[in-house]
Interface confidence: low
């Protein structure tokens, strides 16, 4: 069974996938819909890289920009370096600016909800 | 509601250029792809690429690379394709299509297309 | 490049029947598959995505289904404005492409 045929088996489940089940389907060509990704857990979504947010959700990365200002995508934009978030081309900003240090304080971010930011 | 203008016509001779124009409405111009769709007359349709308007990056199919180059001015929110070097192959109806439904790059609104008639 | 098969160029169908336009995907597509109407003269308009989903405003006798590599736009309750052409299209991956057309035709 090859990736296109496992989302649609598994699409219905994956509203409470963890991370590790989002990086494994981001190498099977999948290209995940938007809706369905925007129904998944946040918590799962931000630890995702820019290349495999690309990857999961192939020619759908698209509608990123257009649900910019909404969770998990908000969230998740907040997290990447902006220079990653300029290489898909969709203008989406928001990202950690260049040249600052993320230090990744779990304790800090479940208090503020944003990552801790040193700058350069 | 979306809207998007296209001048009906155009008659050019071979080996010239043209670009055409795609003038959008009612939605956020910037936000999301605008896709270029090629049709010869009682053939089928053909995808040239698409551009972010926000920042002007692109996609091209590998066969309209040479072809076609597509551009943006943000202030009138229009859309641009030029073709160069024209030969009949190039006679076609030229169709603009935003990306701009529930995050899906099916084409959900269409321009009503220009005709180009490349004779001598 | 994924090629979009619709094998059958023409079909005639009577007012009132029911037909099935057939896409096949040259590889799995999943469900990224969107369907289109276009009449003579006119702009393609937008009746299926992701497989199954109609776009607002379309007419419930059109029904989208499929996934993998072949795909069914089924027409119910044929009424003659519904004399176009069809295609389907992937979005699967890039670059996007169509398939070549079914002409629907009204006895």
């Known amino acids: 069974m090859n990736g296109s045929e496992y989302f649609v088996k598994i699409q219905s489940f994956l509203g409470g996938a963890p991370t590790e089940d989002l990086k494994a389907l981001s190498q099977q060509n999948v290209s995940m819909d938007l809706a369905t990704f925007m129904k998944l857990r946040t918590d799962a979504v931000l630890p995702l890289t820019v290349a495999e947010v690309q990857k999961l959700l192939g020619p759908h990365v698209e509608g990123l920009k257009a649900e910019e200002r909404h969770r998990p995508v908000r969230d998740w934009i907040l997290r990447q370096r902006q220079d990653d978030l300029d290489t898909l081309g969709l203008g989406l900003q928001g990202g950690i600016p260049n040249g600052y240090l993320v230090l990744d304080l779990s304790m800090q971010e479940a208090l503020s909800g944003t990552p801790c930011l040193l700058g350069p | 509601q979306v809207q998007l203008q296209q001048p009906g016509t155009e008659l050019v001779k071979p080996g010239a250029s043209v670009k055409l124009s795609c003038k959008a409405s009612g939605y956020t111009f910037t936000s999301y792809w605008m896709h270029w769709v090629k049709q010869r007359p009682g053939q089928g349709l053909e995808w040239i690429g698409n551009i972010i308007p926000s920042n002007g990056g692109t996609k091209y199919n590998e066969k309209f690379k040479s072809k076609a180059t597509l551009t943006v001015d943000k202030s009138s929110s229009t859309a641009y394709m030029q073709l160069s070097s024209l030969t009949s192959e190039d006679s076609a109806v030229y169709y603009c299509s935003p990306h701009y439904y529930g995050g899906s790059p099916g084409f959900a609104y269409w321009g009503q297309g220009t005709l180009i008639t490349v004779s001598a | 490049d994924i090629v979009m098969t619709q094998s059958q160029k023409f079909m005639s169908t009577s007012v009132g029947d029911r037909v099935s336009v057939i896409c096949k995907a040259s590889?799995?597509?999943?469900?990224?598959v969107a369907w289109y109407q276009q009449k003579p003269g006119q702009s393609p308009k937008a009746l299926i995505y992701s497989a199954s989903y109609r776009y607002s405003g379309v007419p419930d006798r059109f029904t989208g289904s499929g996934s993998g590599t072949d795909f069914t736009l089924t027409i119910s309750n044929v009424q003659s404005e519904d004399l176009a052409e069809y295609f389907c299209?992937?979005?699967?991956?890039?670059?996007?492409?169509f398939g070549g057309g079914t002409k629907l035709e009204i006895k």
């Open positions: 299209q992937q979005y699967n991956s890039y670059p996007l492409t």
């Open positions: 590889q799995n597509v999943g469900t990224n």
